[in-house]
């Protein structure tokens, strides 16, 4: 038969709210050498016990009796700390447990979640959360919205998860949690509410250098707007755009525009060249959400300034044309030149010469076309850009007005009419 | 001595349950936790939970909890295990064993098989 | 859960070897315990709070360790010592087992 128990004082019962400190006590009366005291909870030794151990004689030779007395100290009571507490010694080839104690945990509620502060655009749904554990049990929670109830009493409105189907004005909100014990308030959240995202951003008019965008706002609840902010980045690199990133791989150009209206001229920007925009509405509570970046794209301008460096000479019946790309910008891709030349008292004639950079003209006749000048212009798909001024070709045999032919076999006539002001003609009888 | 003694094996149908009895002997019954292990064929040892007879509470193994049920009678120094809905798969020896922050003795076992 | 590693599986020790069985636990814990199970036998204890020898126990058997690695030695193997060894932890929930390590004599 088993051994009288060694123990001749068990721990007690610590019940009480978290933080709580207390303290737990074993003793028990051996014969010889202490042994070790362990401690259980719920059946398994405590390996980080903040325990100590009290060894004291009771008599003047080794092997008569001691008393042991261990004390298990719970700082900041925990609920991980609750359950059924032992004593624990091995006495030579027996082991000893003391009776139980017990320790609980009772209080106010515990919040293990509580409403966050958030943003949210005005009109739209979101959740709220809040839990919160006693001991004792039940919890119940109450909602509050801008510090009024949101049912009638604890437990008959939403627990765990509030529902809000959407605010126009900024809210707060907090939940009581009620048990047996009493009521804990958790923590006040605000929520914001922002202006709804921008709908329906779109180019309204398109320019070579500029772009004429308008958007539709979203709702704003009770706040007007003040105005929007208007991002432009190129795209030809933007792969981050495209891959749908949130932020533009360079920093974008930013506009604001005043509301109303709902609209926008961006300027200085690059002809022929791809952006991506994007909108957001800002009110006195913050701005909203960006809308998705829209690739747009400026159109192609006519070039800016004329070919450069025109030369024309004459070697008998031919004549030599050539000049360079021009310095000004050319506001698109160059599709050719146009190039015009005409006699003093000849009609003027218009050649098509493509991308090439030079012509030679073939002036039929051995007589000499007096005063005989040649204009160029280069062109992209949006038109001509300006004319040069008129280049002269001295009279090769003053006096002789022969008809002037091309040698290449561009059509004479234009193959579109040419506003009359691009050309300069500048000659008399 | 401590001793612990297992009722006889057992044979059951899928979807049925068994009950495994462990009778203590040798010291306090209700001062030492029993806890129940098992060990299906050729396997290692799986614990499945433990009862305190002092007040009857249980703790189980989230694996076999819903499952698991276990008891114990102080009059006549027994612990209960029950296992319902068996599986093919439960088949196994079933030990009890006293804990004292580990299992320092064990009963012989009792092999249950779940077959159809 | 805490996971224990056995190392070896298997192994084939003539008697009066030195024979060391170690458990390498997934995390840190404070104690660990082993068992002996013989063929068609239950489990027994062997080594308690990781050193202490359990009540019976010849004094051939020794555990030592710290952390996440401990050992099993026994110190000139004998017969009776075919067995399958394992290690177990309870520093946390669940208890967990090692898959054992299963000692031939040869």
């Known amino acids: 038969q088993a051994e009288e128990s060694p123990f001749v004082g068990n721990p007690g019962n610590i019940t009480g709210a978290r933080g709580l400190t207390g303290t737990l006590r074993c003793q028990l009366q051996v014969q010889g050498e202490p042994p070790e005291v362990h401690w259980l909870r719920d059946g398994q030794i405590l390996e980080l016990a903040d325990s100590t151990q009290t060894q004291v004689p009771l008599g003047e030779d080794e092997q008569d009796d001691w008393i042991v007395v261990s004390q298990l100290r719970i700082t900041s009571l925990q609920l991980s700390d609750t359950g059924q507490y032992q004593c624990l010694v091995f006495l030579g080839h027996q082991t000893f447990v003391s009776q139980p104690g017990y320790v609980g945990l009772e209080g106010l509620p515990y919040f293990l979640e509580e409403p966050e502060d958030r943003t949210v655009a005005a009109n739209t749904p979101f959740n709220l959360s809040c839990q919160a554990q006693g001991p004792p049990e039940p919890v119940d929670l109450l909602w509050l919205q801008d510090a009024v109830p949101l049912a009638t009493a604890p437990g008959h409105g939403p627990q765990r998860s509030l529902h809000v189907p959407g605010l126009n004005k900024t809210s707060s909100f907090s939940c009581e949690a009620h048990n047996a014990k009493g009521v804990t308030t958790s923590r006040t959240a605000t929520i914001t509410v922002l202006p709804q995202q921008p709908r329906n951003l779109h180019l309204v008019s398109r320019q070579p250098t500029e772009l004429e965008v308008a958007w539709t706002p979203g709702l704003s609840g009770i706040y007007p707007l003040t105005h929007c902010t208007l991002q432009a980045v190129l795209s030809d690199d933007g792969m981050g755009i495209q891959a749908g990133e949130p932020d533009p791989p360079e920093e974008p150009l930013t506009s604001q525009a005043s509301v109303p209206p709902h609209q926008l001229r961006l300027g200085s920007l690059h002809p022929h060249t791809p952006y991506h925009i994007r909108v957001a509405c800002t009110s006195s509570q913050g701005p909203s959400s960006w809308t998705h970046w829209l690739p747009v794209e400026t159109p192609e301008g006519v070039p800016l300034g004329p070919p450069e460096n025109i030369s024309a000479t004459r070697n008998g019946s031919q004549a030599f044309v050539h000049w360079q790309e021009p310095r000004a910008p050319l506001q698109g891709t160059l599709l050719g030149y146009r190039l015009a030349y005409q006699g003093q008292d000849t009609p003027e004639v218009l050649m098509d010469i493509g991308l090439r950079q030079e012509v030679t003209l073939e002036l039929q006749g051995d007589g000499s076309v007096s005063n005989l000048t040649v204009c160029v212009a280069a062109y992209t798909a949006a038109g001509d850009g300006p004319w040069s001024l008129p280049v002269p070709l001295e009279a090769w045999r003053p006096g002789q007005a022969q008809p002037v032919h091309q040698l290449v076999k561009e059509p004479s006539t234009p193959a579109f009419s040419w506003p009359h002001h691009h050309h300069h003609h500048h000659h008399h009888h | 001595q401590v001793q612990l003694v297992q009722s006889g094996a057992e044979v059951k149908k899928p979807g049925a349950s068994v009950k495994v009895s462990c009778k203590a002997s040798g010291y306090p019954f209700t001062d030492f936790y029993i806890n129940w292990v098992r060990q299906a064929p050729g396997q290692g040892l799986e614990w499945m939970g433990w009862i305190y007879p002092g007040s009857g509470n249980t703790k189980y193994n989230e694996k076999f909890k819903g499952r698991v049920t276990m008891t114990r009678d102080t009059s006549i120094s027994t612990a209960y295990m029950e296992l319902s809905r068996l599986r093919s798969d439960d088949t196994a020896v079933y030990y009890c064993?006293?804990?004292?922050?580990?299992?320092?003795?064990w009963g012989q076992g009792t092999l249950v098989t779940v077959s159809s | 859960e805490i996971v224990l590693t056995q190392s070896p599986d298997f192994q084939s020790v003539t008697p009066k070897e030195k024979v060391t069985i170690t458990c390498s636990a997934s995390s840190s814990i404070g104690y660990m315990y082993w068992y002996q199970q013989k063929p068609d036998q239950s489990p027994k204890s062997l080594i308690y709070?990781?050193?202490n020898l359990a009540s019976g126990v010849p004094s051939r058997f020794s555990g030592s360790g710290s952390g996440t690695d401990y050992t099993l030695t026994i110190n000139s193997l004998e017969a009776e010592d075919a067995a399958t060894y394992y290690c177990q932890q309870w520093s946390s929930n669940p208890p967990t087992f090692g898959q054992g390590t299963k000692l031939e004599i040869k």
């Open positions: 709070l990781t050193s």
């Open positions: 064993a006293r804990s004292t922050g580990f299992f320092d003795y």
